[in-house]
């Protein structure tokens, strides 16, 4: 079952997510989506790294924490009730199945 | 192909406010934060803060906290530095910058072209 | 705040040189440092960031190097368009400092 997490209309909402990098900036594609995490990738990608940076994000997605040491958490600005549901982080891990999946809950009150 | 493009250059007085733009184009105005970078004459670059272009929420370096303002006008895509009670100290070139609103993503790789103000009684 | 400090303040060269600039941080910012480059009455242009990271449309002759507190642009063989004053930045702790900069003059 999915971790949930919670925060009020017109606030920021916080996601937690982190990996381990083999150093800092040895980086592991991550990406965040809005539904659960599928077999593969991310459905509806609103945040996304690779291997040197974040490369694409849309609009109120942001990370806050220090990536290049694997602190992946999204942050989500000035949420509102349609924020609300499953969102996915998948640590993109080289080789067959390796992904770490996390699916979090965000209740928006 | 992205842009930013700032106001003309400004000849003020001592006492007086001035309010340079910087108009943004060729991306989503709202994914990326604007920076404003002060550099006066023959010297190097300064940090004034920066303006999240989602919220609206400046960030001020402690040296510009006072008489400085940024603002944005979302949907021309602009953003805004407002200096106010000018002092010659203030003579220099400002520098509109793009940055991701990531807190650790801090280079800018796009810059405005500039607007030099220049304040004298 | 993070105090960068560039050297030298000046450097003289001639074309085909291989050229290094040198950034000190006052403290450890990991590879949280960004290089820019400033021709004479132009904005600053990024060249390299997150110390050692090239730019899309950046000569390949531009890289750098570093970790910690000590960092390093070199220009493998300098050409004439290369004059300007070259700047570091701390991009780890705001307000994301710059170093002085390093004016480089050709011959």
């Known amino acids: 079952s999915e971790v949930e997490y919670r925060a009020e209309v017109g606030q920021n909402a916080y996601l937690p997510c982190f990996y381990t990098p083999a150093a800092p900036g040895n980086l592991v594609p991550v990406c965040w989506g809005k539904g659960a995490c599928p077999v593969f990738e991310c459905g509806n990608v609103v945040l996304r790294t690779d291997e040197r940076d974040v490369n694409y994000w849309t609009s109120r997605y942001w990370l806050n924490g220090d990536f290049r040491k694997g602190d992946v958490s999204l942050t989500i600005e000035n949420v509102t009730l349609a924020d609300s549901g499953i969102y996915c982080c998948r640590i993109q891990i080289p080789g067959i199945m390796n992904d770490e999946k996390f699916n979090l809950k965000l209740v928006i009150k | 192909q992205i842009q930013l493009v700032q106001s003309g250059p400004e000849l003020k007085k001592p006492g007086e406010t001035v309010k340079i733009s910087c108009k943004a184009s060729?991306?989503?105005?709202?994914?990326?934060?604007m920076s404003w970078v002060k550099q006066a004459p023959g010297k190097g670059l300064k940090l004034m803060g920066w303006?999240?272009?989602?919220?609206?929420?400046?960030t001020y370096a402690d040296d510009f906290k006072g008489r400085f303002a940024f603002s944005l006008e979302t949907s021309a895509s602009a953003a805004y530095l407002q200096i106010n009670n000018l002092k010659n100290e203030d003579t220099a070139t400002y520098f509109c910058?793009?940055?991701?609103?990531?807190?650790?993503?801090?280079?800018?790789?796009?810059w405005g072209q500039g607007t030099t103000l220049t304040v004298s009684s | 705040d993070i105090v960068m400090t560039q050297s030298p303040a000046t450097l003289s060269v001639t074309p085909g040189d291989r050229v290094s600039l040198s950034c000190r941080a006052s403290q450890s910012i990991s590879d949280y440092l960004h290089w820019y480059q400033q021709k004479s009455h132009e904005s600053p242009r990024l060249l390299i960031k997150y110390a050692s990271q090239s730019i899309s449309g950046i000569p390949s002759r531009f890289s750098g190097s570093g970790s910690g507190s000590d960092f390093t642009l070199s220009i493998n063989s300098v050409e004439p368009e290369d004059v300007g004053v070259y700047y570091c930045?701390?991009?780890?702790?705001?307000?994301?400092?710059f170093g002085g900069g390093t004016k480089l003059e050709i011959k």
């Open positions: 303006i999240n272009t989602y919220s609206g929420a400046p």
């Open positions: 930045q701390n991009g780890h702790s705001f307000p994301y400092t």
């Open positions: 060729g991306y989503t105005f709202t994914t990326y934060g």
């Open positions: 910058a793009r940055k991701p609103p990531h807190y650790y993503v801090n280079s800018f790789d796009y």
